[in-house]
């Protein structure tokens, strides 16, 4: 159902081979990002509430592709989740607070998260850290899910099952 | 061809530590998702560790067997994987595999022989 | 965490006959985020590593002889060796990647007649 209005391959808005997107779009594509469809000669990429497309050899269209089907985009783009080990300061944090990368389920706490980002980034401070230096970002706002995950889909259950050491401090919920 | 090569197995007694090293090529490093599988003489595999890639953080996970006592780094400038393994048990004699999750597959090195033994 | 049952756990075929191994999961292993199923089969020989033959549950990897089918979706999969060949003596087993704790089936030993 290529070209189709209602079906599957229906673009929202389509980018040119010729202007791939720029690295603050991917971002936000890494961080909306819920499906993706092949299509005949471009595949379709679910967001949020908006859909987007681009050619199947672009390369940064087979780049959201893998990121997806290794659950290291949409709900599993965890820039916020409770129980890191590791939080580098050179990639901002900015996503659903799950390891989970399917949702068909959104839960009141989910639905916060995709308000505040659409302003703000949210970000956790972490506890025990791994690299060199610690990321620190006081005037945004920080979500503490309290080792709890924020999505249904898969692997959705990873962050409640690391130790308590792990787990960052206590951080203030502000929603404005 | 894509290859993965682990290193820093050996004999250890119960209580100490090893370091294992897994040196990647012949895909992109950075994009894969890491993981160690163990598997002792004669049993099953064994999943035991995950890092994630630097758009999350490298965010890690661990086996509940092996959770407080091993440590998952990468460095992606180097297309290598480290497991720190401290506070080493009997139990976790093994063989000790590097995989590396891509899109195009898993891909797996030949292993390296963990053994505890007093 | 997934439970990866996987049947027969042994399986004598005679050369040339088509040998069938199952798996089974505890929750379905299908991603709506791409419609993909995130199972792999992998065939062992002793004293060698797991080699990756299906991926994607059907997705048969690069040298991988055609006589290796992966099918099913879902929480049901089938791994099948068509004209079963000497070499294709092994351990074989089904693995879940689409959650962590990755976890493995038991395996299927595979025996010559």
């Known amino acids: 159902n290529e070209g189709s209005v209602t079906g599957s391959c229906y673009c929202g808005k389509r980018i040119s081979s010729d202007s791939p997107p720029s690295v603050q779009f991917m971002n936000r594509l890494r961080k909306h990002l819920r499906a993706y469809h092949r299509c005949l000669y471009y595949t379709r990429f679910q967001l949020l509430s908006w859909s987007v497309c681009g050619g199947n050899k672009d390369p940064w269209v087979q780049e959201l592709m893998s990121c997806l089907d290794l659950k290291e985009c949409g709900h599993a783009y965890s820039g916020i989740v409770a129980h890191q080990k590791h939080l580098l300061p050179t990639s901002p944090p900015i996503s659903q607070a799950s390891e989970g990368a399917s949702s068909d389920i959104h839960t009141p706490a989910q639905m916060l998260l995709s308000t505040l980002q659409s302003t703000q980034r949210p970000t956790l401070p972490v506890g025990s850290l791994s690299s060199d230096k610690e990321l620190t970002r006081p005037n945004e706002t920080t979500i503490h899910t309290a080792g709890h995950s924020l999505a249904a889909g898969p692997e959705a259950g990873e962050n409640q099952k690391q130790p308590e050491k792990n787990a960052g401090p206590t951080a203030r919920t502000s929603a404005t | 061809e894509v290859q993965l090569v682990e290193s820093g197995g050996g004999l250890v007694q119960p209580g100490g530590s090893l370091k294992l090293s897994c040196a990647a090529s012949g895909f992109t490093f950075s994009n894969a998702v890491m993981n160690w599988v163990r598997q002792a003489s004669g049993k099953g595999l064994e999943w035991v560790a995950r890092?994630?890639?630097?758009?999350?953080?490298?965010?890690?996970f661990y086996a509940d067997s092996v959770k407080g006592r091993f440590t998952f780094s990468r460095d992606d400038s180097k297309n290598t994987a480290y497991l720190q393994m401290n506070s080493l048990k009997t139990e976790d004699t093994a063989m000790y595999y590097c995989?590396?999750?891509?899109?195009?597959?898993?891909?797996w090195g030949q292993g390296t022989l963990v053994t505890v033994s007093s | 965490d997934i439970v990866m049952t996987q049947s027969p756990s042994s399986l004598a075929v005679s050369l040339g006959e088509t040998a069938t191994i199952n798996c089974k999961s505890s929750?379905?292993?299908?991603?709506?985020?791409?419609?993909?199923?995130?199972l792999a089969w992998y065939q062992q020989k002793p004293g060698q590593p797991p080699k990756l033959l299906i991926y994607?549950?059907?997705t048969r990897q690069s040298g991988v002889p055609d006589r290796f089918t992966g099918s099913g979706a879902g929480t049901d999969f089938t791994l099948t060796i068509s004209s079963v060949q000497a070499e294709d003596l092994a351990i074989y087993y089904c693995q879940q990647y689409y959650d962590t704790p990755w976890t493995f089936g038991g395996g299927t030993k595979v025996e010559i007649k």
């Open positions: 994607w549950a059907s």
């Open positions: 890092i994630r890639t630097k758009p999350n953080n490298y965010a890690t």
């Open positions: 929750q379905s292993l299908l991603y709506s985020g791409n419609q993909k199923n995130y």
């Open positions: 995989t590396a999750w891509t899109t195009e597959g898993i891909y």
